[in-house]
């Protein structure tokens, strides 16, 4: 019996065709993805062949305008017209808090939305019983499927689970839930999640039962043979791990954004066990032609945001660098912009001492989302700003102690190299780290703006002294494991929102032209 | 246990109103849609229309958007219909359903109106 | 407004036959059809949604398919408390609209 897995993951609001790079689209023949494209493909593979499914596997939410101003409807929308069969829940999913997947996604949604580890207590277990489930079993052709889901633990650290969800050990919570679809005679088990290709592959080395694994989370690109653009494959699709129990388990992603879609083949023998498995990822090009109804619905529902996003804020006339690539790994214009403006925001107090009251900024790497491509006429929208600031964020004020900041910029590069998103950009600090030393040992230099000056200069950081800092509200409350900073601030103001920041900053200067100027070294 | 009960039968006099009730228990009643479909003998069924516990928000059948409104109480876990300005052709039973996954999952027993002088 | 166009709108079937109602739609409705049963005087009973998924306790001779705009509903054994009227309803776009109904009775 063979069974076809069309699979998507971290879309993070890609609903309209992007440019390569997945940032915003500006020559149409030659962009990629969107959903009126997947729901071509998608309806071709169904016509073709009898026993398909349609897995979502997290990260819906969160990453442009349209979750910006729709908040999630649109995702229940669009992954309803589509026809999904099931979701995971990924860990932006909880970007709003509970209430902003409940209300949206959860009880509009026309599939099962899965995941096995996370558990409600309190007032909340009874509010959002039956709204996820551990696992679906679902009917396909004359067989049935079951699908277990699992979310990242880390998601408190990442999110706005708020405190009445409890993020269990994935493998811990899957195991018991996979026993119990083998004991309704449940023999084809697909696990579905969103806690990265590490945890997919352990996932299936050590849970009993797991025939698939379907995975999310570390935006990982597989492919055999030659890749189709610019994504190198982390290994082979599918990735075959062998399990502790001596199965061969097929782990597959699909990279991110609605770029591809994944798609595997699996044969299972009649004891449901997995004979073969081949597929690739499907490369959405305009070689495949959007849906017309699905265009045309997209572009009913795009009015609200042209209002809310079109007009222009102002001009780069070079090309702002926010991708991955770099802010996770070096001093990246986009951060350096970025920063700039979080200081310019804070511009007041200033007296015949101080020549203003903050001088220093950090902005997690991780939290810059996209590039902003200059050859569109130099043209920036706040459309274009809140797929670089896509969490709907506050740059906050903080006052930390000298030994704090050291700590940060340790952790910044503790596991440096990983594409991790707590490596810091900065603004009014000049950082030299020996990546050659211990991690927790690797700050060698690290400089700070006065501000007490009339003319600014850089001194080094004083273990001893109170500094004001501005920050994302993601870091001042300990995100990307910046527990340091939660736990020893000693004071949090909290500040304007974070795309209006930029955005404001970007109307004020007209033009910009940020450069990779030698702050991080 | 999920129940959806409905007040009892009503016989009102044309022209009235009335309202029917739909008490849910069992489950979160804010995490799931309520919807009333209208069975009568000459038109079978019919969709009146939806609404969301947690908020009020409503959505109808814009052949009912002059005839029903629905609302809720939170706090006693009610659905509420109101029917206005009732005809003969308004003699029917209504029935309240919880929706998941936008379909329905459990109704309730039903509640008959008989419109008559 | 979809149209939904249920046959037969009445059958007569012998225990342990295999019946098969269809509803034919007016416009694709991607998959997004439920059937259910109502006994006289009792209120309805949701059997199906997605066209294919059994509600849990349902018996398992009973199933759906389709897709776009043709579904069927099928009970493969037919056994006597199976006797009722059965329908179909969309609920792809808003309004939701029902079939007429099949009326099943005992050979």
């Known amino acids: 019996w063979e069974l076809t897995i069309l699979h998507t993951n971290d879309v993070h609001s890609r609903l309209e065709q992007t440019s390569e790079d997945s940032s915003k689209c500006v020559n149409a023949s030659r962009c990629m993805g969107g959903v009126a494209r997947l729901f071509t493909k998608v309806q071709q593979i169904r016509r073709a062949e009898p026993n398909v499914l349609l897995l979502d596997a997290g990260d819906q939410y969160q990453g442009t305008i349209w979750f910006t101003v729709y908040k999630g409807a649109e995702v229940a929308h669009f992954m309803n017209a589509l026809r999904y069969d099931a979701m995971a829940l990924g860990n932006h999913e909880f970007d709003n808090g509970v209430e902003g997947l409940i209300e949206p996604l959860l009880k509009e949604a026309k599939f099962p939305i899965l995941s096995a580890n996370i558990k409600a207590k309190g007032p909340l277990a009874s509010q959002i019983s039956g709204l996820y489930l551990p696992y679906k079993v679902l009917p396909v052709g004359d067989e049935v499927v079951g699908i277990v889901g699992y979310t990242s633990k880390e998601t408190p650290f990442l999110s706005n689970p708020g405190t009445n969800l409890v993020f269990e050990d994935e493998i811990t919570a899957l195991q018991p839930e996979v026993d119990k679809l083998k004991t309704l005679n449940v023999n084809k088990i697909i696990a579905l999640g969103h806690s990265g290709f590490e945890t997919d592959k352990l996932i299936a080395q050590k849970v009993r039962g797991v025939d698939v694994v379907v995975g999310g989370h570390s935006n990982t690109f597989l492919y055999t043979g030659n890749p189709p653009s610019k994504e190198v494959p982390a290994g082979k699709y599918p990735f075959i791990v062998t399990s502790d129990d001596g199965r061969k388990v097929p782990v597959v992603q699909a990279y991110a954004f609605g770029k591809y879609l994944g798609y595997l083949k699996i044969e299972f023998d009649e004891r449901g066990n997995v004979i073969s498995s081949h597929g690739n990822p499907i490369l959405l090009n305009s070689s495949i032609p959007e849906d017309p109804s699905i265009k045309a619905d997209i572009n009913k529902w795009r009015i609200k945001l042209d209002n809310y996003s079109t007009q222009e804020l102002g001009k780069t006339i070079v090309y702002l660098d926010g991708s991955s690539q770099s802010c996770r790994f070096r001093e990246c214009n986009m951060g350096n912009l970025i920063c700039d403006a979080m200081i310019n925001n804070n511009l007041r107090h200033a007296d015949e001492m101080f020549w203003n009251h903050v001088s220093m900024c950090i902005l997690n790497g991780g939290g810059i989302r996209s590039p902003i491509d200059e050859r569109n006429n130099g043209t920036i929208t706040w459309e274009n700003l809140a797929a670089v600031l896509p969490f709907g964020g506050t740059f906050d004020l903080v006052q930390l102690k000298g030994s704090t900041l050291k700590k940060a910029f340790e952790h910044s590069v503790h596991r440096y190299g990983q594409s991790t998103g707590e490596f810091l950009q900065v603004g009014g600090i000049h950082v030299v780290y020996d990546l050659s030393r211990k991690p927790g040992d690797r700050v060698v230099k690290l400089d700070v703006l006065c501000t007490k000056c009339r003319v600014p200069s850089y001194d080094p950081l004083k273990m001893d002294e109170i500094y004001k800092v501005i920050l994302p509200n993601f870091l001042a409350n300990g995100g990307d494991g910046f527990q340091m900073i939660k736990d020893e601030l000693l004071r949090h103001d909290s500040g304007d929102q974070d795309i209006n920041v930029v955005s404001t900053y970007i109307s004020k200067m007209k033009v910009i032209y940020p450069a990779v100027e030698g702050r991080i070294k | 246990e999920v129940q959806l009960q409905q007040s009892g039968p009503e016989l009102v006099k044309p022209g009235a109103s009335v309202k029917i009730s739909c008490k849910a228990s069992?489950?979160?009643?804010?995490?799931?849609?309520i919807h009333w479909v209208k069975q009568s003998h000459v038109k079978s069924l019919e969709w009146i229309g939806r609404i969301n516990p947690y908020n009020g928000a409503t959505t109808y059948n814009q052949n009912f958007k002059d005839k029903a409104s629905l609302t809720v109480d939170k706090s006693s876990s009610t659905a509420y219909m109101e029917l206005h300005s009732l005809t003969s052709e308004d003699s029917a039973v209504y029935y309240c359903a919880r929706f998941h996954y936008g379909a329905p999952d459990y109704w309730g027993q039903g509640t008959t109106l008989t419109v008559s002088s | 407004d979809i149209l939904m166009t249920q046959s037969p709108s009445s059958m007569y079937a012998s225990l342990g036959e295999r019946v098969t109602i269809t509803c034919k739609a007016s416009?694709?409705?991607?998959?997004?059809l439920t059937w259910f049963q109502q006994k006289p005087g009792k209120s309805p009973k949701t059997l199906i949604y997605?066209?294919?998924i059994l509600v849990d306790g349902v018996p398992s001779r009973f199933s759906g398919s389709g897709s776009g705009q043709d579904y069927s509903l099928t009970i493969s054994s037919l056994e006597f408390e199976d006797m009722g009227i059965y329908y179909c309803l969309q609920y792809d776009e808003f309004p939701l609209t029902f079939g007429a109904g099949t009326k099943l009775e005992l050979k």
């Open positions: 997605r066209a294919n």
């Open positions: 069992g489950y979160s009643f804010t995490g799931y849609y």
């Open positions: 416009q694709d409705i991607n998959t997004y």
